[in-house]
Amino acid sequence: FSPLRRISIKILVHSLFSMLIMCTILTNCIFMTMNNPPDWTKNVEYTFTGIYTFESLVKILARGFCVGEFTFLRDPWNWLDFVVIVFAYLTEFVNLGNVSALRTFRVLRALKTISVIPGLKTIVGALIQSVKKLSDVMILTVFCLSVFALIGLQLFMGNLKHKCFRNSLENNETLESIMNTLESEEDFRKYFYYLEGSKDALLCGFSTDSGQCPEGYTCVKIGRNPDYGYTSFDTFSWAFLALFRLMTQDYWENLYQQTLRAAGKTYMIFFVVVIFLGSFYLINLILAVVAMAYEEQNQ
């Protein structure tokens, strides 16, 4: 080994070196939280970049760059260090127009703490292992969601566009001409029935067990879907999102009530099956796999 490499190895294995890097990262994180940093922080930024560069150079000199089994770039944790340094120099010396987008990558510096703190490294390792093991469960989950999204698509496509429209058409009015003139929420409220405090027109359906319109209103399919158009089963992707919402139980009771009002109470069977299979079974299966992966990593 050359004297330079010997010195690099000595520095690399020294505990003070690890402490220096850890303190640098933590101080860097504190500086990144500043709202309006003063001008002198620019010099501090250069110092941090210098320390990170020095750390990487020490590692490269001690272990080699990329040829060989234990070299710098063969360790995935060093990829992060390398990216941090590359972006530090890119944002500083290369004029790339929208630099603010590249500055976002400075946040990656905080992730360097993972590679420095041994306990944290183990936990993250376990997390990555669990993700690898989750692939089969994820495939099963996506498959199940896709199947139910297709069923939902067939059962409820367009149903959430059903609204209670006022009965009388004046002069030469048509639904189409009215819809073309509607602009503000107030305009909508003139023609459609809204429950007090509701931001969407009252949903209704054409079957006997679905929601009915009050006196003087007719159920029509027109306009956009509820929740600014985000809640629907009109395309596979929207249906998939709705199913994901059911699986994660994210305000699912609202989706359930909206759909049952528009389609009919019979369709509660669909929701019972999805909640039992998606929410109770699949979610717990995912948790079980994660728990197993952690157990294996600990052993």
Epitope: F165, T218, V220, K221
Partner: nanobody, 120 residues
């Protein structure tokens, strides 16, 4: 294209009766509302009666108890007019809010209008 065809208009005596019929031709997936409107000379068009698929029926105050709207099938409906008065003289239009197919939004369709004259 969906078309509404009316029949049954004409001349009637005061106190007499007439029956108007309307049929929807062409592709019809779902009729949301069937209605009859009328336009009296020099007046605006007004809703006379309407019926929904779930059986909800409404009438304008001036015809309650005299006129009866009914569904004669999935694509046909009629207006039975009894105890006619000269004020009932108008062009009667058949109207439907319907979806031509399952993917379409509800659209408005009008008949060409049929003249009802009540005169002695």
């Amino acid at each position: 294209e969906v078309q509404l065809v009316e029949s049954g208009g004409g001349l009637a005596q005061p106190g007499g009766s007439l029956r108007l019929s309307c049929a929807a031709s062409g592709p019809v997936f779902n009729i949301n509302k069937m209605a009859w409107y009328r336009r009296a000379p020099g007046k605006q068009r007004e809703l006379v009666a309407s019926v929904t698929p779930t059986g909800s029926i409404s009438y304008t105050d001036s015809v309650k108890g005299r006129f009866t709207i009914s569904r004669d099938g999935s694509k046909r409906w009629s207006l039975q007019m009894n105890s006619l008065t000269p004020e009932d003289t108008a062009v009667y239009y058949c109207n439907a809010l319907l979806q031509p197919d399952s993917y379409s939004n509800t659209r408005t369709y009008w008949g060409q209008g049929t003249l009802v004259t009540v005169s002695s």
